[in-house]
Amino acid sequence: MAVTACQGLGFVVSLIGIAGIIAATCMDQWSTQDLYNNPVTAVFNYQGLWRSCVRESSGFTECRGYFTLLGLPAMLQAVRALMIVGIVLGAIGLLVSIFALKCIRIGSMEDSAKANMTLTSGIMFIVSGLCAIAGVSVFANMLVTNFWMSTANMYTGMGGMVQTVQTRYTFGAALFVGWVAGGLTLIGGVMMCIACRGLAPEETNYKAVSYHASGHSVAYKPGGFKASTGFGSNTKNKKIYDGGARTEDEVQSYPSKHDYV
């Protein structure tokens, strides 16, 4: 029961986390205009990974996409890449984990296969969460660097006496959403990995049984199913003796000590 709960909770937590990563990636408020000790403007700026926006005092908001790819800072491109990789890995992880859920029966899928898939999705969630946290942290570091640079030089000269306003930017809501979402995805991934251990059936030790065939005396030694891989060394139709001989095709699935569904 505990394993099923851990797996289910891991899935839900990861799902929320990945939804958050997607939301953060799409949000426009990665950086927002710093209102403290700045010239008071009639407009409010905020920027995302894909476009920058300006909200006027009337509430009218206008956004412009970054229509260039080569003209963008390498760091911004790196953040975009990290977030997209995080989303893709997370999405694949979700897909895999759906089939791995113990409460969902798909054909005659064995616990070993489910354990395998749970571990795979768990690792994917962990990497996805790390990608999101890394992406958001890189962007935050970029903001901090630019903030202090623009604080040191609030107004940049444009030749002669003409000056231009240097707008300073601070952390936007998307950064916090990204950090929390990345953390949740990471936690969900860890929970899936923990659940994987409980899902894996204990290794069965089969005693070697010898039987006498009409011509030769042959001892068959089974290669007990490996829980970690889900694949045994037995090939199709090789006899495995456990008291009553039957082929692998005929082996019945008995409930394990973890199976309560």
């Epitope: 010239p39 009639a42 407009v43 920058s52 300006v54 006027e56 005092s57 009337s58 509430g59 000056q163």
Partner: antibody
Framework: EVQLVESGGGLVQPGGSLRLSCAVS????????MHWVRQAPGKGLEWVAY????????YYADSVKGRFTVSRDNAKNSLYLQMNSLRAEDTAVYYC????????????WGQGTLVTVSS | DIVMTQSPDSLAVSLGERVTMNCKSS????????????LTWYQQKPGQPPKLLIY???TRESGVPDRFSGSGSGTDFTLTISSVQAEDVAVYYC?????????FGQGTKLEIK
Amino acid sequence: EVQLVESGGGLVQPGGSLRLSCAVSGFTFSSFGMHWVRQAPGKGLEWVAYISSGTTNIYYADSVKGRFTVSRDNAKNSLYLQMNSLRAEDTAVYYCVRSGYYGSSLDYWGQGTLVTVSS
Amino acid sequence: DIVMTQSPDSLAVSLGERVTMNCKSSQSLFQSGNQRNYLTWYQQKPGQPPKLLIYWASTRESGVPDRFSGSGSGTDFTLTISSVQAEDVAVYYCQNVYIYPLTFGQGTKLEIK
């Protein structure tokens, strides 16, 4: 039709106080920021103060800071300008102006009310 | 504070003539976030309150004749009247609507010869 009607102007002695009012109609007053702009006789325009729709942002020209207070009553569709410690240089026609939806422009102006500061 | 300087102070032109007036700001009024210039032009006829002509430096307010056009970016702006009419006699003001305190130029007076 958008209408802004200023009132409360008149003759006042230096150091005195005056409260200007602006009655608004023809639009949803509570959705727009409002400005006060003045124009001394024969001179150019001078921006005085701004108050946002929800009164969260209030800004003043340096020349009136600490002496003038802008306020609004959204329920009464009214804008106010409380003027204290008046000086001769405050003599002007005071306009009540709506902040436009686009471009932070000042799109609708009242006819103005004359304030004369003289002894 | 941003200082707005208009030139010339006054000009007299003949009817149908093309006229341009300039406005220069001490700081850039360009907003990179939306690629807009926060400069506005007003027309004030004698005995009347000012009237909004152009916002965002080049966008005509609805109801304004298309002979009026605005241009420029950053710190240098121009108001052009392609063919002056008798009713265009007025004082024209530019205004910084980007940084508080909002500031006006001293005005350009347009007269007919």
